[in-house]
């Protein structure tokens, strides 16, 4: 059994979440990868995904989310820029492997965004907003969304849970639909 763990990031509005998801490059280098949010009482919702097949070092931007897949390092870099309080929640990286079930990569990210800035005077807290220059509208990616055929009645665990897993990836639910997913606006 594998412990499904969380890592917490506490950030202020306007700041950037920057995480890297480690995957087995021989198995998954060209597989499509996605960034999902897990809301209480719901199945994971895909917010952004790489192309299929995933392109090496090619940034994919969906709203304020930027994905970069580095095949030679076996890393998916995820950035969420100009964070808002409503972005707070539980997130995860997954790898799509049709027709197999998708795999989740460790760890889940518990993002807590609060108002105001924590910086000392003179620190450039808002630098990421200037660097990335996010356009007001971007193309919303078409990503698979994997949902359970059963109605969800209970939220995913907020702490750790035992799940059976091959290697370091966790089996998610069965594939039932592919839909266009709303993203951050």
């Amino acid at each position: 059994a594998t412990k499904l763990t969380e890592e917490k990031y506490e950030l202020k509005e306007g700041q950037t979440l920057d995480v890297k998801c480690d995957y087995t490059l021989e198995k998954f280098a060209s597989s499509q990868k996605a960034w999902q949010i897990i809301r209480d009482g719901e199945m994971p919702k895909t917010l952004a995904c790489t192309e299929r097949p995933s392109k090496n070092s090619h940034p994919v931007q969906v709203g304020r989310i930027i994905l970069e897949d580095y095949h030679d390092h076996g890393l998916l870099r995820v950035r969420m820029v100009n964070l808002q309080v409503e972005d707070s929640g539980l997130y995860q990286c997954v790898i799509y492997q049709p027709p197999k079930e998708p795999h989740m990569l460790f760890d889940r990210i518990r993002l807590v965004v609060t108002k105001g800035f924590s910086g000392t005077p003179g620190s450039n807290e808002n630098s990421t907003q200037n660097v990335y220059k996010i356009p007001p509208t971007t193309t919303k990616a078409l990503c698979p969304l994997y949902t359970s055929p059963r109605t969800v009645t209970q939220a995913p665990p907020k702490s750790t849970a035992d799940v059976s897993t091959p290697d370091s990836e966790i089996n998610l639910t069965n594939v039932t639909d592919i839909i266009r997913v709303p993203v951050f606006n």
Epitope: T2, K3, T5, E7, Y9, E10, L11, K12, Q15, T16, D18, V19, K20, C21, D22, Y23, T24, L25, E26, K27, H73, G74, R77, F106, D107, I109, S118, S127, T128, V131, T165, D167, S168
Partner: antibody, heavy 119, light 108 residues
């Protein structure tokens, strides 16, 4: 509880070899990258090497590249560092460290093992 | 290679006082910074990651701030167990992942 414990340190002559080992427990070992970080006597911390959770990706500091080899056995929850062509400058306490699941920082450290390279 | 510079090298503070440690990166690392505490004869311990987030079990008297190239670790009211050496480390993307040279916080 996450635990990492190093072993294998000792005294070795310049040009010699040594193999360090690290036994890990309390977490899903194959899900996390692992690293070696060293600290020369009275000095600061220096990152040495990192290996991904699956073992498919390895990274080395320029100072050890071509001389040190990092490896892991996920069936035994162990991490190794094979050190060849050792130099006096390699004298340090070597720490085994678990890499966080979301970024390349070190969330759990072993107590370290001392490697002394001297004739 | 990103160079991390900490200041001051030594900070003399009385128990109960506030301590402010600085760390500067040679190029922007956004918030990809961690702080560690190391006591004599012991392994380092993670205090802060992502520039602001306290690691599990770290008291709230420790706080991190800054982004880009300038970072600060603040200890609001120094306790006897806080006297140690503190290191910052960047983890923006690729190796080498570098540490600052350390700041020693000693009793005044």
């Amino acid at each position: 509880e996450v635990q990492v414990l190093e072993s294998g340190g000792g005294l070795v002559q310049p040009g010699g070899s040594l193999r360090l080992s690290c036994a890990a427990s309390g977490f899903t070992f194959n899900a996390y990258a692992m690293s070696w970080v060293r600290q020369a006597p009275g000095k600061g911390l220096e990152w040495v090497s990192t290996i991904s959770g699956s073992g498919s990706t390895t990274y080395y500091a320029d100072s050890v590249k071509g001389r040190f080899t990092i490896s892991r056995d996920n069936s035994k929850n162990t991490l190794d560092l094979q050190m060849n062509s050792l130099r006096a400058a390699d004298t340090a306490v070597y720490y085994c460290a678990k890499v966080a699941g979301s970024n390349f920082f070190f969330d759990h450290w072993g107590q370290g093992t001392l490697v002394t390279v001297s004739s | 290679e990103i160079v991390m510079t900490q200041s001051p090298a030594t900070l003399s503070v009385s128990p109960g006082e506030r301590a402010t440690l600085s760390c500067r990166a040679s190029q922007s690392i956004n918030a990809n910074l961690a702080w560690y505490q190391q006591k004599p004869g012991q392994a380092p311990r993670l205090l802060i990651y992502g520039a602001y987030t306290r690691a599990t079990g770290i008291p709230d008297r420790f706080s991190g701030s800054g982004s880009g190239t300038e970072f600060t670790l603040t200890i609001s009211s120094l306790q006897s167990e806080d006297f140690a050496v503190y290191y910052c480390q960047e983890f923006i993307m690729w190796p080498p992942w570098t540490f600052g040279q350390g700041t020693k916080v000693e009793i005044k």
